[in-house]
């Protein structure tokens, strides 16, 4: 629970609790904003961010757009509240523990995004779910 | 009973340092995620920063990355914060934290001191 002696404040947002009416605590994510990458043609990529961030509200998740036009591919590393939308879309996977990439339609390249709510989950952004090696059922395929 | 006792705060003009100091007893330290958190007058709580064990990974917010660095003295059970170029926006209400899951997925017991006060000002 909130401790006693911590100021509670009139305005809601500024202390976030979860079910249980304990703080809740941010989650970890790359946090490098737009860089070049070299993510191209691959089942995942890894997010080649080396700084990892606090993020600033709880309620924040983490955050992955892959972007491909006719000079370079960058890939944006960022926290995010997936209560507002983000390159004008909602963070519908917000909840996901890995970072799915969902292509969306915006014109004059390809663009894809994710966004996932555990430590660090956009440090490993995947493209193929199917490919995905956390997956039980390929682990039991490589495996066998 | 776990407790958390922070020392340190104090009055230091802009650009000065401080090191606050977090005495842990009741539990065992040294394998506890320990976290910095302020409260500014009149605001939330802010994160300012994580150290985790075992690893000892440390992580900031971006307000104080390269200015604070969070450490740790499992032999002392103290947790430290070394402040660096202090500006007048840290002014605020430094608690530490403890965090440990509960066993059910996504939930956590969390613990905090009673906090320090460190104001910055010239």
């Known amino acids: 629970t909130i401790p006693p002696h911590v100021q509670k404040s009139v305005n809601n947002d500024m202390i976030v609790t979860d079910n249980n009416g304990a703080v809740k605590f941010p989650q970890l994510c790359k946090f490098c904003d737009v860089r070049f990458s070299t993510c191209d043609n691959q089942k995942s990529c890894m997010s080649n961010c080396s700084i990892t961030s606090i993020c600033e509200k709880p309620q924040e998740v983490c955050v992955a757009v892959w972007r491909k036009n006719d000079e370079n591919i960058t890939l944006e590393t960022v926290c995010h509240d997936p209560k507002l939308p983000y390159h004008d879309f909602i963070l519908e996977d917000a909840a996901s523990p890995k970072c799915i990439m969902k292509e969306k339609k915006k014109p004059g390249e390809t663009f894809f995004m994710c966004s996932c709510s555990s430590d660090e989950c956009n440090d490993n952004i995947i493209f193929s779910e199917e490919y995905n090696t956390s997956n039980p059922d390929l682990l039991l395929v490589i495996f066998q | 009973e776990v407790q958390l006792l922070e020392s340190g705060g104090g009055l230091v003009q802009p650009g000065g340092s401080l090191r606050l100091s977090c005495a842990a007893s009741g539990f065992t330290f040294g394998t506890e995620q320990m976290w910095w958190v302020r409260q500014a007058p009149g605001k939330g709580l802010e994160f300012v920063s994580r150290i985790d064990s075992p690893g000892g990974r440390t992580y900031y917010a971006n307000s104080v990355k390269g200015r604070f660095t969070i450490s740790r003295d499992n032999s002392k059970n103290t947790l430290y914060l070394q402040m660096n170029s202090l500006r007048a926006e840290d002014t605020a209400v430094y608690y530490c934290?403890?965090?440990?899951?509960?066993?059910?997925?996504?939930?956590?017991?969390?613990?905090w001191g009673q906090g320090t006060l460190v104001t910055v000002s010239s």
């Open positions: 934290a403890k965090r440990r899951p509960t066993g059910v997925s996504g939930t956590f017991y969390d613990y």
